[in-house]
């Protein structure tokens, strides 16, 4: 039977090395065996390149195309082929369809003043246009309570977020994930980073007097544990000293 495209290709670029196009066929298709996506930069002397698509689902195909470091003027001509049959033809401008790379290496560290320091890495090298354009969304959720979640927008430059332990339930396990977008490029959101999980422990300090540091913190690495021990010792002494004066 004839091969038809149900939903035409939708493409996004990470604006550094890769563009990804996805489309849906009208019936289950072996994408890599039956289809080819050709792409060519509209630039004098540019060669034609071919992308072999892969299946995402039975009838959904996806093609990842290596591109050079994108610039605003770049426009690609795309042609979707089934053998000698041209199924679809269109153009794609990476700078107008940006989906940032996923932020990486999300970690949670105990910090001074009963805060958790969430850190992640900017997925772009400093010389890339997007490096200084990214803002982030951090989602923090209670692993055992779907109603208990918070969303933080990080609009400043550094890929960090300070989170007061008191804003989270004590003794609960929390997961955080982060995604990025580039406002000036009117981008879509990146995919979410893998989640990182930690155990939150917070009680009002009045209840801590005379109590040992609780065990749940042992889930932290030794460096983090030392940091929080020192921070809590200092704060405990300050707190105690404060009460003596009054």
């Amino acid at each position: 039977g004839s091969v038809k495209v149900l939903h035409e290709p939708s493409c996004f670029s990470d604006y550094i090395s890769t563009s990804v196009c996805q489309w849906k066929m009208d019936h289950p298709t072996n994408c890599s065996a039956e289809l080819r996506l050709s792409y060519q930069l509209d630039f004098m002397g540019s060669e034609n390149h071919t992308c072999v698509p892969e299946n995402r689902e039975d009838s959904v195909c996806v093609c990842s195309m290596p591109i050079d470091d994108a610039v605003e003027a770049d426009v690609y001509q795309l042609d979707l082929w089934a053998g000698q049959q041209l199924l679809w033809s269109g153009s794609f401008q990476p700078s107008k369809h940006v989906k940032p790379r996923t932020p990486g290496n999300l970690t949670v560290h105990p910090n001074i003043s009963h805060t958790w320091l969430l850190m992640w890495t900017n997925p772009y090298p400093t010389e890339n246009h997007l490096h200084s354009e990214l803002t982030y969304m951090v989602n923090v959720s209670n692993d055992n309570d779907p109603e208990d979640f918070k969303v933080y927008n990080v609009t400043y430059m550094g890929p960090t977020l300070r989170l007061a332990a008191s804003t989270l339930k004590s003794g609960a396990s929390y997961s955080a994930r982060v995604r990025a977008w580039a406002q000036t490029y009117n981008s879509t959101w990146s995919d979410w980073s893998p989640s990182t999980t930690w155990l939150n422990y917070y009680e009002p300090w009045e209840q801590h007097l005379g109590k040992p540091i609780p065990n749940p913190l042992l889930g932290l690495d030794s460096t983090g544990l030392n940091d929080i021990f020192e921070a809590q010792k200092i704060e405990w002494h300050e707190h105690h000293h404060h009460h003596h004066h009054h």
């Epitope: 540019s46 060669e47 290596p66 050079d68 610039v71």
Partner: antibody, heavy 125, light 112 residues
Framework: EVQLVESGGDLVKPGGSLRLSCVAS????????MTWVRQAPGKGLQWVSL????????YYADAVKGRFTISRDNAKNTLYLQMNSLRAEDTAVYYC??????????????????WGQGTLVTVSS | DIVMTQTPLSLSVSPGETASISCRSS???????????LDWYLQKPGQSPQGLIY???KRASGVPDRFSGSGSGTDFTLRISRVEANDTGVYYC?????????FGQGTKLEIK
């Protein structure tokens, strides 16, 4: 040493044909687009045609479109210009030159960085 | 087609002085930040052309730093400082951005 050597220039009558060759050495020929540029006696430079590294893309000046064909044999490191239906105004020295690097997605450009010595084509009755 | 216009068409300069040649294009040659597709070539008497400057300001291999290119968009300049007798010839600007590639008319530099 990077070098281009043209040949094939001759005296030909109007309406006649000629094939110019340009043999390249000293660089990876297939990775680069190649260009033909001509210069009529006492005149300036005029671009004629360009071909991508694989030979898959060709471009022509309006003055020669439909009459001239650029091609290449990467196995022989040779660029060609087939010239048909020649006219008096095609009289010129024809130069081949190394153009942009086309093995990358966006061609990398370093100018026409090597030129041949030129071959003279004279179209006259 | 992109039209390239050079000024002046001829120039006479004493040795040691600076020569400036202007080139204007009918369309912007700025493809992306820092990438102006404009070249300068020199054709010495009886010789093939040779590349001097590409992408507006980058010197071709082996070209002395007396030669410098500047400008962006549609207006470009070639400067030759401390001119020498060997610099005699015709200077051409060229745009390699769009087909057809187009050259300026040429500027003839004469050393007094």
């Amino acid at each position: 040493e990077v070098q281009l050597v043209e040949s094939g220039g001759d005296l030909v009558k109007p309406g006649g044909s000629l094939r110019l060759s340009c043999v390249a050495s000293g660089f990876t020929f297939r990775d680069y687009a190649m260009t033909w540029v001509r210069q009529a006696p006492g005149k300036g430079l005029q671009w004629v045609s360009l071909i991508s590294g694989s030979g898959g893309k060709t471009y022509y000046a309006d003055a020669v479109k439909g009459r001239f064909t650029i091609s290449r044999d990467n196995a022989k490191n040779t660029l060609y210009l087939q010239m048909n239906s020649l006219r008096a105004e095609d009289t010129a020295v024809y130069y081949c030159a190394v153009d942009r690097l086309t093995k990358t997605i966006r061609p990398q450009y370093y100018g026409l960085w090597v030129w041949g010595q030129g071959t003279l084509v004279t179209v006259s009755s | 087609d992109i039209v390239m216009t050079q000024t002046p068409l001829s120039l006479s300069v004493s040795p040691g002085e600076t020569a400036s040649i202007s080139c204007r294009s009918s369309q912007s040659l700025l493809y992306s930040i820092g990438y102006n597709y404009l070249d300068w070539y020199l054709q010495k008497p009886g010789q093939s052309p040779q590349g001097l400057i590409y992408l507006g300001s980058k010197r071709a291999s082996g070209v002395p730093d007396r030669f410098s290119g500047s400008g962006s968009g549609t207006d470009f300049t070639l400067r030759i400082s401390r001119v020498e007798a060997n610099d005699t010839g015709v200077y051409y600007c060229m745009q390699p951005l769009q087909s057809p590639l187009t050259f300026g008319q040429g500027t003839k530099l004469e050393i007094k």
